[in-house]
Interface confidence: low
């Protein structure tokens, strides 16, 4: 007869292995009992159990509590034994000898190998602002056993740097993500993808970037000088930019206060029925914790008595 | 004009697999990202997960572990699979369209998903 | 993930009325907030993003306002229609949505 075992069995942390050992006799061979111990080079063997055909399952006190017979049915010539909640210290050597009747003793070895998943982190760089040069966007580390596999996932253009720190019985690796903030890259994922063989799926956490900008401001609403004439309703100026943070606009004249009557909405001024008191310079500030800018236009409301052309200059200021 | 409409079936056995699919027009799935979110009387509204222009994912921390989403360009339509479903994944499940950000400009009209034996 | 809690749960106003609805979030989102609107048995409809912008063809007596954690959706004069359910929702990393205001007629 023969032994059936396996050369590697791998669990992950946590998880029961199963060390299998059966004898494969020839017809009326019978088992008489099946040792258990650990036998890592360089140190004695330990005995984990021992199982017997007459008196059951005697377990070491080493490992009380911790190794079981599988569940029934059972085949009398199977000397595999359970070993519950299998931690990092349990990888190493295992041999079972079986006693036989009338063939003698035989033995094998497996190895028994703990997987430990890793656990990601992500952690967010500083914070990004349009104008930086190559900037760390995220870094993500993952620490197991063996060495897991971090990569990025994004469709946002960067350079990634690894490294890793191996440990007794684990290995941590880290990865960065640099990147040259730009606008576009506003809301866009940027995904750390841990992989392990002690994972059924890749684990993904994900960061969300945001890259502080403003616009250059610029104001609607001149675009037709002739209708900026006395006595027209529904007058308005609006004033156009954007930015991470979301702006806050604001409205001056440059030559004076807002006269009476002009409302302002947010990004919005608008007039009560024009007279010649609304021409001047009038400035839209726009501001979010990143940058401020201005932009001024002149307003010349004509009077249809008048001929006289309106003029009409923009000026944009950082 | 831009629509998006969810399909699959309404009844689902609890610890099966519920499969979704959400067909857009007006709008090509490569331009824009496809989010699906739920809604259910106990929970309220939920984001899932989104399929981003580029065909990267991303999930819910929570539905990480159940959670499948993939697409098929060419019949501009997303795929959505939840796993080991249980009673308190019945729910109206809606697709819905954003742009770079998390904002959900258009909605599909939703469909209701009962798990129950 | 970060908590949006939305107040009031529910409130009864009549046509005409200016209606307010606040959202809070548990830390700052950087005015990274939407609102929706839902009618019974329909699909939420977006109204305003990034806390101030109204969405294309939305009315004007919409408006949203607000910074850091605290943002206010503002029907300046509510009307027949605006009978719906609203919620405020961040994207401010992975979203999630406040617990809805109903507006019920009084």
């Known amino acids: 007869g023969e032994l059936e075992t396996s050369d590697v069995v791998t669990v992950v942390l946590g998880q029961d292995a199963k060390l299998p050992c059966f004898y494969r006799g020839d017809s009326g061979e019978q088992v008489g009992q099946v040792a258990w111990a650990r036998v890592d080079a360089g140190e004695g063997a330990q005995e984990l159990a021992l199982l017997h055909s007459k008196y059951g399952l005697h377990v070491s006190p080493a490992y009380e509590g911790r190794v079981e017979q599988p569940p029934p049915p059972r085949n009398p010539l199977d000397g595999s034994v359970l070993l519950r909640n299998a931690v990092q210290a349990d990888e190493g050597e295992y041999e079972c000898r079986v006693s036989t009747f009338p063939a003698g003793s035989f033995q094998a070895r497996l190895r028994l190998r703990v997987l430990v998943p890793p656990l990601p982190s992500l952690n967010p760089g500083p914070a990004l602002e349009e104008g930086q040069g190559l900037t760390l966007a995220a870094s993500c580390t993952a620490e197991g056993s063996p060495a897991p596999s971090v990569t990025w996932d994004t469709e946002v253009k960067g350079t990634t740097s690894s490294r890793s720190f191996k440990h007794s019985r684990s290995a941590a690796v880290t990865s960065e993500f640099h990147l040259v903030p730009s606008r576009s890259m506003n809301g866009q994922p940027l995904t750390c993808v841990v992989s392990h063989p002690g994972l059924l799926q890749d684990q993904r956490i994900t960061h969300i970037l945001h890259v502080s900008f403003l616009a250059e401001a610029s104001v609607r609403g001149l675009e037709d000088q002739n209708l900026w004439h006395i006595g027209r309703e529904g007058a308005m100026l609006k004033c156009l930019s954007e930015g991470q943070p979301p702006p806050s606009y604001n409205w001056t004249r440059l030559d004076g206060p807002l006269p009476s009557g002009v409302r302002v909405d947010g990004d919005t001024l608008g007039f009560p029925p024009l007279t010649t008191e609304h021409s001047g310079i009038y400035v839209c500030h726009v501001s979010n914790e990143f940058s401020s800018r201005d932009s001024q236009v002149t307003v010349d409301v004509l009077d249809p008595q008048e001929d006289s052309g309106k003029q009409v200059d923009l000026v944009s200021a950082s | 004009q831009v629509q998006l409409k969810e399909s699959g079936p309404g009844l689902v056995q609890p610890s099966e697999t519920l499969s979704l699919t959400c067909t857009v027009s007006?709008?090509?799935?490569?331009?824009?990202?496809v989010h699906w979110i739920r809604q259910s009387p106990g929970k309220g509204l939920e984001w899932l997960g989104v399929i981003w222009s580029g065909g990267s994912t991303d999930y819910n921390a929570a539905f990480v572990s159940r959670v499948t989403i993939s697409r098929d360009n060419s019949k501009s339509q997303v795929f959505f699979k939840l796993n080991s479903v249980q009673a308190d994944d019945t729910a109206v499940y809606y697709c819905?369209?954003?742009?770079?950000?998390?904002?959900?400009?258009?909605w599909g009209q939703g469909t209701t998903v009962t798990v129950s034996s | 993930d970060i908590q949006m809690t939305q107040s009031p749960s529910s409130l009864s106003a009549s046509v005409g009325d200016r209606v307010t609805i606040t959202c809070r979030a548990s830390?700052?989102?950087?005015?990274?907030l939407a609102w929706y609107q839902q009618k019974p048995g329909k699909a939420p409809k977006l109204l305003v993003y990034a806390a101030t912008n109204l969405a294309d063809g939305v009315p004007s007596r919409f408006s949203g306002s607000g910074s850091g954690t605290d943002y206010t959706l503002t029907i300046s004069s509510l009307q027949p229609e605006d009978f719906a359910t609203y919620y405020c929702q961040h994207f401010w990393g992975t979203p999630t949505f406040g617990g809805g205001t109903k507006v019920e007629i009084k």
């Open positions: 819905a369209r954003s742009g770079k950000w998390y904002y959900f400009d258009y």
């Open positions: 007006g709008f090509s799935i490569t331009n824009y990202g």
């Open positions: 830390e700052n989102i950087y005015s990274n």
